[in-house]
């Protein structure tokens, strides 16, 4: 079977301040099992934006129903965008591991740019 790929089709997204950003991400397989997480930035200092498994992310909603057993769409919406939200967002697939899940595949990233509200 084909190895799972994480696809972020948009290299960049431009959103006006105060609006909602949609960051698209799909996986090509359900296997290996494990959660999807979204990060802003790369490397050790990256910021967790959304974790499928757990946590409270009040500004983030998922585009699809992640409780569907065959769901492979992990796109998210981030509400009330501000200039501080600008950056590159990565959709990352983890495979289950013990005691911690193991990073398996990352999307290529989507750069979010924020257009200031006209004064």
């Amino acid at each position: 079977e084909e190895e799972l790929q994480v696809i972020q089709p948009d290299k960049s997204v431009l959103v006006a301040a105060g609006e909602t950003a949609t960051l698209r991400c799909t996986a090509t397989s359900l296997i290996p099992v494990g959660p999807i997480q979204w990060f802003r930035g790369a490397g050790p200092g990256r910021e967790l934006i959304y974790n499928q498994k757990e946590g409270h992310f009040p500004r983030v909603t998922t585009v699809s129903d992640l409780t569907k057993r065959n769901n492979m769409d992990f796109s998210i919406r981030i509400g009330n965008i501000t200039p501080a939200d600008a950056g590159t967002y990565y959709c990352v697939k983890f495979r289950k591991g013990s005691p911690d899940d193991v990073e398996f595949k990352s999307g290529a990233g989507t750069e979010l740019s924020v257009r200031a509200k006209p004064s």
Epitope: L30, I31, P32, V33, P35, Q52, K53, E54, D65, L66, T67, K68, R69, N70, R95, K96, S98, P99
Partner: antibody, heavy 117, light 108 residues
């Protein structure tokens, strides 16, 4: 506190129908997938059916076509419609909340369905 | 689909360590859980996602996995731990939940 309370069980004759309900409280019902699991007298657990928050449905092989899972997110109720019942359907039926990866974290106390002539 | 196999019974003295194994499924496509059931009661989840313990479950319960075998370990077994224990799995390939046949834990 998460609470799941099943109702609707009882004694029916073979070929008859029954609808089970599971009233949920203490969590955001509309955000969680749910399942029904049954246990025949003196036997082990058997997964019956599952439903996503958006009402996509999934069934165990032994019940496909006869049992229908559904939900009403406005009332926080999970249902199991059981048709063409046979003696093999005699069991305690539990409703269970699913975790993000479709295992179960909370269970109701169960409701007994007896199919007997 | 797949079958989960566990021993019908395990016996242990109080204070000792009990280990219940469950085999079957595929590591990369299956998540496992352990459910405790006492006579006349509903199941209680003691481990989910292979090795995650709910906050209200005592620390003496732990889960581990190696290849296609998962293990429930109860350290310092107490009399109240006597129950049936079911291994459960979710297979991401088939979208199916499966249970093992159950293991009766007897505390001598």
């Amino acid at each position: 506190d998460v609470q799941l309370v099943e109702s609707g069980g009882g004694v029916v004759r073979p070929g008859e129908s029954l609808r089970l309900s599971c009233e949920a409280s203490g969590f955001t019902f509309s955000s969680n997938a749910m399942s029904w699991v049954r246990q025949a007298p003196g036997k082990g657990l058997e997964w019956v059916a599952g439903i996503s928050s958006g009402s996509d449905t999934y069934y165990g092989d032994s019940v496909k076509g006869r049992l229908t899972i559904s939900r009403d997110n406005s009332k926080n109720i999970l249902y199991l419609q059981m048709n063409s019942l046979t003696a093999e359907d005699t069991a305690v039926y539990y409703c269970a909340r699913e975790t993000w990866n479709h295992l179960f974290d909370y269970w109701g106390l169960g409701t007994l369905v007896t199919v007997s002539s | 689909s797949y079958e989960l196999t566990q021993p019908p019974s395990v016996s242990v003295s109080p204070g000792q360590t009990a280990r219940i194994t469950c085999s079957g499924g595929d590591y990369y496509s299956t998540y496992y859980a352990w459910y405790q059931q006492k006579p006349g009661q509903a199941p209680v989840t003691v481990i989910h996602s292979d090795d995650k313990r709910p906050s209200d479950i005592p620390e003496r319960f732990s889960g581990s996995s190696s290849g296609t075998t998962v293990t429930l370990t109860i350290s310092g077994v107490q009399a109240e731990d006597e129950a049936d224990y079911y291994c459960g799995g979710y297979d991401g390939r088939t979208y199916i939940n499966t249970f093992g046949g159950g293991t009766k834990l007897t505390v001598l």
